[in-house]
């Protein structure tokens, strides 16, 4: 906190300009009018203030706006945004996407900070849902943003926003998140034809149920092994050898290299060895011929 002292004669700031870098902290406190600062915030970015000087400027704005800054000031905070705490940001009401972009730009190239996370949270809550333009903006700055949301938060994403999602945006999503996103993607892309639909839906297939995988196997999609390995194990297990062969097309040969990894390993254990042999890949571990397979889950459901 800077002590309250009178401004020396002739030092009263008439505008926010570079001469202020020569002011000591107490002079900035005494000689810069907070209302002037608020109206000329856009100039602060062009002046190489020290971090200590920025602290003083922030303090002046805090005094002027104890209930939180207006959006007209927030939009022009520039690197002063980095001085804000999550508590400061919780007082803000940010409604403009332009303001959001301006502040995300300040943090560009860095990990998502607590300040940015709070800002995004405030913005999205204010909008009521994660619309396409917002999602576009957020994933442009933070490709992993979508996967940082809880399944509950993802449920507020409208299907129309899914068009903004790129494959790399889903790289760190876990199966619970894909379970929420997949039905939205299915709805969003439902009017596309077979091959185009598969290109779009592919990144979301980690949330697909068995019946959708069976349907895809009838469409000559030639799913690659990387996508297959990300499928839900419980969705893959009921697929027959013929269905997996159709689903993977020429990529079926890749199963051999993955036979010790899930979901391939678990799927092999559920197949008849005879059927696996038809693939000619030397996959081992299937159910030997003559064994009876009891589906205990079906038995439990009936009792």
């Amino acid at each position: 906190e800077v002590e309250k002292t009178a401004c020396p004669s002739g030092k009263k700031a008439r505008e926010i300009d570079e001469s202020l870098i020569f002011y000591k902290k107490w002079e900035l406190e005494a000689c810069v009018d907070a209302a002037l600062l608020a109206t000329q915030m856009d100039r602060v970015n062009a002046i190489p203030f020290t971090y200590e000087q920025l602290d003083v400027l922030k303090h002046k704005l805090d005094e002027l706006y104890p209930q939180g800054y207006p959006e007209s000031v927030i939009q022009h905070l520039g690197y002063l945004f980095l001085k804000m705490s999550p508590e400061d940001i919780r007082k803000w009401n940010v409604t403009s996407l332009e303001t959001l972009k301006a502040l995300l730009e300040v943090n560009k190239g860095h990990e998502m900070s607590p300040q940015v996370a709070t800002l995004i949270d405030r913005f999205v809550k204010g909008r009521g849902q994660l619309d396409k333009d917002t999602l576009d903006t957020l994933t442009a700055f933070y490709p992993g943003y979508l996967c940082s949301l809880s399944p509950e938060e993802l449920s507020s994403v409208p299907p129309s926003s899914i068009w903004a999602v790129r494959p790399q945006d889903l790289d760190t999503c876990d199966p619970r998140q894909l379970d929420v996103l997949y039905p939205k993607a299915r709805l969003a892309f439902q009017n596309m034809n077979g091959s185009e639909y598969f290109v779009k839906i592919q990144s979301f297939l980690g949330g697909a149920p068995t019946e959708d995988l069976k349907a895809l196997s009838q469409q000559n999609v030639s799913m690659d092994l990387a996508t297959f390995m990300k499928l839900r194990t419980d969705a893959v297990l009921p697929l027959t050898v013929a269905e997996v062969q159709k689903l993977l097309g020429p990529h079926v040969e890749g199963l051999k290299a993955e036979e010790r990894h899930r979901p391939v390993r678990d799927w092999i254990l559920r197949q008849r060895q005879d059927d696996l042999d038809t693939l000619g890949l030397g996959l081992q571990g299937g159910i030997p011929n003559g064994y009876l397979v009891l589906d205990l889950s079906m038995q439990e459901a009936l009792s």
Epitope: E18, D42, R43, N45, A46, I47, P48, F49, T50, H76, G78, Y79, F81, A102, E105, V106, K108
Partner: nanobody
């Protein structure tokens, strides 16, 4: 790596001269206003000199006016501080800072170079 590196500091006698350099790597200095600052032991960091991104505008702290000159060579991605008639009170760590201006919120600080004025 994006950084500012200062050089040119050292030990000099009162009345002597030094030329400090602030070189940018990893980004182009053309678009940045530059400030030179100094910090003496136990004192607040203070602004010494300023030059606009175009080089058309310069400014100085009262304590160095007429003795220090700031300039820039954008082709060399470097800003200079020519310090003449040095006094013991000019002693300190000198560092440069770059500010990008509206629409460019990047700013950079160098680690500093030490200047000692003593007989």
């Amino acid at each position: 790596e994006v950084q500012l590196v200062e050089s040119g500091g050292g030990l000099v006698q009162p009345g002597g001269s030094l030329r400090l350099s602030c070189a940018a790597s990893g980004f182009t200095l053309d678009y940045y206003a530059i400030g030179w600052f100094r910090q003496a032991p136990g004192k607040e960091r203070e602004g010494v000199s300023y030059i606009s991104s175009s080089g058309g505008s310069t400014n100085y702290a009262d304590s160095v006016k007429g003795r220090f000159t700031i300039s820039r060579d954008n082709a060399k991605n470097t800003v200079y501080l020519q310090m003449n008639s040095l006094k013991p009170e000019d002693t300190g760590v000198y560092s440069c800072a770059a500010a990008g201006g509206y629409g460019n919120s990047s700013r950079y600080w160098g680690q500093g170079t030490s200047v000692t004025v003593s007989s």
